[in-house]
């Protein structure tokens, strides 16, 4: 079976937008109207990986460009980067685990945890504007919490 | 605890309709990449897979009973309702729903299934 | 008869190894994840190996499965008596558009 995908948008549990920042970077920061064009469209695969109770492996792809959510060790610290991929070959049922985040939903809550990287986190900060990475903390100052609107195909 | 639970009656006629319900609790079927299916065992046999529905309420069939079949769901009530119409004694089995997830397609947890007689 | 092709019965000794092959095509294992299920006299199937290899959460790691095209295969080691069961092997079929089974193999534990 190909693999299922559903294009969606995310913000954060302070209603902060995704929005690119350069070529390889999101940022988060509030949008009204408009501006809410402008926060990336992700179409989230399905992906074969370790499964646990509440926990669906998932890759994070941006809609119609060949750029994927990815985590990389960076002078040793785990590091969420936005990668360019082959759109020849991906998405495919098993990416590589530096692609693949277990999504943890719970209540309309959802957390996206780095297969490679247990206990490391898609966060934002509190600041307005602040880049999205990879926090290896969860209930502290930084944010993990996120909320997923559905777009129509 | 994920736990999944069929209820339904235990004897249903020839040409009846059999109406099965799956109670679940521990996860909700409004998650993303998450299904419900019903699984069917006749006595010593083997396993049959009947029908499935995801969080996005796409269903699925097996062919050669898809005329006879329809699933649905209540995500309030955590509960994923099969119905089988034109009911006969080769349908009877042990029938078992079993969640299973968008990316193994594998039914990781099992309800502990019940016994459907056709008889007249 | 069923999609996926499995031995009816095997048997082996205590504390020995078995292996359970499952034959498809490549409308189900070929380009799908295989998944196990072990099911216990009188009882619900419970799920061993999905994603052809991976163990299931609180299942022996005397368990293991693998896959090679079109076939798939499940592996117990250090048989014990309490492994007598029927095992299933099942993956999504593209064709069909849903899952298949195996015809499910009988495992004897001699002795």
């Known amino acids: 079976a190909p693999v299922r995908s559903l294009n969606c948008t995310l913000r954060d549990s302070q209603q902060k937008s995704l929005v690119m920042s350069g070529p390889y970077e999101l940022k988060a920061l509030h949008l009204q109207g408009q501006d809410m064009e402008q926060q990336v469209v992700f179409s989230m695969s399905f992906v074969q990986g370790e499964e646990s109770n509440d926990k669906i492996p998932v890759a994070l792809g941006l809609k119609e460009k060949n750029l994927y959510l990815s985590c990389v060790l960076k002078d040793d610290k785990p590091t969420l980067q936005l990668e360019s991929v082959d759109p020849k070959n991906y998405p495919k049922k098993k990416m590589e685990k530096r692609f693949v985040f277990n999504k943890i939903e719970i209540n309309n809550k959802l957390e996206f945890e780095s297969a490679q990287f247990p206990n490391w986190y898609i966060s934002t900060s509190q600041a307005e504007n602040m880049p999205v990475f990879l926090g290896g903390t969860k209930g502290g100052q930084d944010i993990t919490d996120f909320t997923m609107q559905f777009v129509s195909s | 605890q994920v736990t999944l639970r069929e209820s339904g009656p235990a004897l249903v006629k020839p040409t009846q309709t059999l109406t099965l319900t799956c109670t679940f609790s521990g996860f909700s079927l409004s998650t993303s990449g998450m299904w419900v299916s019903w699984i069917r065992q006749p006595p010593g046999k083997a396993l049959e897979w009947l029908a499935l529905?995801?969080?996005?309420?796409?269903?699925y069939y097996t062919t050669s009973l898809k005329t006879r079949l329809t699933i649905s769901k209540d995500t309030s009530k955590n509960q994923v309702v099969l119905t089988m119409t034109n009911m006969d004694p080769v349908d009877t089995a042990t029938y078992y729903c079993a969640r299973m997830r968008e990316g193994s397609r594998a039914f990781d947890i099992w309800g502990q299934g019940t016994v459907v007689t056709v008889s007249s | 008869q069923s999609v996926l092709t499995q031995p009816p019965s095997v048997s082996e000794a205590p504390r020995q190894r078995v292996t359970i092959s499952c034959s498809g095509s490549?409308?189900?294992?070929?380009?799908?994840?295989v998944n196990w299920y072990q099911q216990l006299p009188g009882k619900a199937p419970k799920l061993l190996i999905y994603n052809d290899d991976l163990l299931s959460s609180g299942v022996s790691d005397r368990f293991s499965g693998s896959k090679s095209g079109t076939s798939a295969s499940l592996a117990i080691s250090g048989l014990q008596s309490e492994d007598e069961a029927d095992y299933y092997c099942a993956a999504w079929d593209d064709s069909l558009n849903g899952p298949v089974f195996g015809g499910g193999t009988k495992l004897t534990v001699l002795g």
């Open positions: 490549s409308s189900n294992i070929g380009d799908n994840a």
């Open positions: 529905i995801d969080w996005g309420d796409d269903k």
